[in-house]
Amino acid sequence: AWELTILHTNDVHSRLEQTSEDSSKCVNASRCMGGVARLFTKVQQIRRAEPNVLLLDAGDQYQGTIWFTVYKGAEVAHFMNALRYDAMALGNHEFDNGVEGLIEPLLKEAKFPILSANIKAKGPLASQISGLYLPYKVLPVGDEVVGIVGYTSKETPFLSNPGTNLVFEDEITALQPEVDKLKTLNVNKIIALGHSGFEMDKLIAQKVRGVDVVVGGHSNTFLYTGNPPSKEVPAGKYPFIVTSDDGRKVPVVQAYAFGKYLGYLKIEFDERGNVISSHGNPILLNSSIPEDPSIKADINKWRIKLDNYSTQELGKTIVYLDGSSQSCRFRECNMGNLICDAMINNNLRHTDEMFWNHVSMCILNGGGIRSPIDERNNGTITWENLAAVLPFGGTFDLVQLKGSTLKKAFEHSVHRYGQSTGEFLQVGGIHVVYDLSRKPGDRVVKLDVLCTKCRVPSYDPLKMDEVYKVILPNFLANGGDGFQMIKDELLRHDSGDQDINVVSTYISKMKVIYPAVEGRIKFSTGSH
């Protein structure tokens, strides 16, 4: 038998420095977690102790903090090289700055293979990107060989900016021939490493013949066997065992997100490359693990350039700004309310005595809110805090939509509720009631909107044929997160101001903020 240790990360989202327990900015260093310096300590400790170790990343290193805002991916290549990652799969966020923003800082600089079997380049891009990412890579591990085959969410064109010259194929369809090729080349230990979410990870384990292990990302899934060491609630045991269609037991793993944990999976293979056993758990990278001094020094050196962003206080919050995915993708969150209020405030235009304002409504995809802000840092809110919340460099735009389009959008918001997907809408100037006992597409039971043509704003039922103005992220205006109905049916679209700037201006204007959860989004069961 031959034993392989798979160390894995996913959805690190630019958390190069240690963070607080909720993955926002580190406030109390003695209680902080993660970061590449601490990760390196643990990785090196395991490499020294165990013979056959692979360090893998399942995508979405890009996007999430000021590090990416400033360094645009160069930081990812530099520190992943320093940690000596063995392979990385492309995530959807690797395309946030377009293909050029992937090629130049990361693909050309990485000293490790970057993988995706289901992304096919066409046109002039094909020759430009050729060889810079691969469908698979055969890696030497001790005296054995291991094949790693990559995959990326086929939803990426809806979630990011890959352009028109990359085709995202069905994962399973694309993976099978690559796995077959690896087997034909005598590679009998194959890991699927990718970024399509836990449900797809499980499907790959079930459907792709020859895959021995699946290491995933995208859904920030936390798996754990036994008592979990922090706040994350396990979605299942680690590893999660899937019985494949050909009767094999295939371990599937993911390691939450934000570099808080290091996935640790031990696999035992027989001489034919069959998995005999698998066990492990994510390792919580808490302060009991020291930060590596050399990596920490390097972080501090790179950090200097960021300090202009970090030091400027924009205003204060006297409440916790809950921007966690656990809240904002499931229910009204006060970070969503804050942002929407800022978006409306930024669009106050008293141009007509008949209207208190030309626009009263805001919608914001919960998945676009990427971090909370802890008030226990003297209440200070900085550019860096906001860059972690709104890392995408988008704009808040003005559109005109029919009521019927808005209704469709709110149905889409909850059509697959409960899977922590980003399309759950946060709102301003809207009161919505959902009944989740009803079938998808028929769950919005009440939708009231704030009047504009009124001296005293009040909420009235949405009219299907009326045209409304709405402030929303350009991401949604462009049909992102599956809001194709907005893109297809919008009657007018005017691009607006930079998202962080809108919120920072609002906070600076307000000086002290205390957004609440106030019943903008409600859930009910029964007749209406």
Epitope: S130, V138, P140, K181, L185, N186, N188, R209, G210
Partner: antibody, heavy 125, light 110 residues
């Protein structure tokens, strides 16, 4: 030593069938993909088929697809090529060969590193 | 019809250097390693060289290989009479899902 010994060639009429065998020794047969390659008189080498180490994956050249079947018996260290609906243009010397993934440093090279002695198949009426 | 193209013949006098080219595409040479085989009449083909100059034991170092983009080449320096044979390049082809051989080059020692 590592060797592949072939058998089963001969003269056969068009439309008939023939089965070639290849006996392996000196290496762990079940760890290697195996190929069949042929050379028609006066022509170059033509790849025919491959089978993965465990027999689960098989690929064929377009010229033989649907007529030839590659198989293996790992318990007997044997490789086979079942040739049905033979045609005149299948006349060739057939070779079995071992597919080898060689590691040199961190680079892997794939080649056919061990070959059988060849067996002549003549399709003629 | 082979998808790897080689010149049909090459020749040289003893001691000379002979180079054989092998042209393919992104689905074979472009994305996979190349091997070269020597085939003497009446014998089985023999693996001669891997891409980037790696030779199996017993193959003299006057044989060298290289690859650039979608092409490969085999060089024989210090040509000897026993080098008279047919030479084939080969690579896995991802589009065809199979191993492909070149058209073959007959090397003659004058």
């Amino acid at each position: 030593q590592v060797q592949l010994v072939q058998s089963g060639g001969g003269v056969v009429q068009p439309g008939r069938s023939l089965r070639l065998s290849c006996a392996a020794s000196g290496f762990t047969f079940s760890s290697y993909g195996m190929h069949w390659v042929r050379q028609a008189p006066g022509k170059g080498l033509e790849w025919v088929a491959v089978i993965s180490y465990d027999g689960s994956i098989k690929y064929y050249a377009d010229s033989v697809k649907g007529r030839f079947t590659i198989s293996r018996d790992n318990s007997k260290n044997s490789l086979f090529l079942q040739m049905n609906s033979l045609r005149d243009d299948d006349t060739a010397t057939y070779y079995c060969a071992r597919g080898h993934l060689l590691r040199i440093g961190d680079i892997f090279y794939y080649s056919l590193d061990v070959w059988g002695q060849g067996t002549l198949v003549t399709v003629s009426s | 019809q082979s998808v790897l193209t080689q010149p049909p013949s090459a020749s040289g006098t003893p001691g000379q250097r002979v180079t054989i080219s092998c042209s393919g595409s992104s689905s074979n040479i472009g994305s996979n390693t190349v091997s070269w085989y020597q085939h003497l009449p009446g014998t089985a083909p023999q693996l001669l060289i891997y891409t980037n100059n790696h030779r199996p034991s017993g193959v003299p170092d006057r044989f060298s290989g290289s690859k650039s983009g979608t092409s490969a080449s085999l060089a024989i320096s210090g040509l000897q009479s026993e080098d008279e044979a047919d030479y084939y390049c080969a690579a896995w082809d991802d589009s065809l899902s199979g191993y492909v051989f070149g058209t073959g080059t007959k090397v003659t020692v004058l």
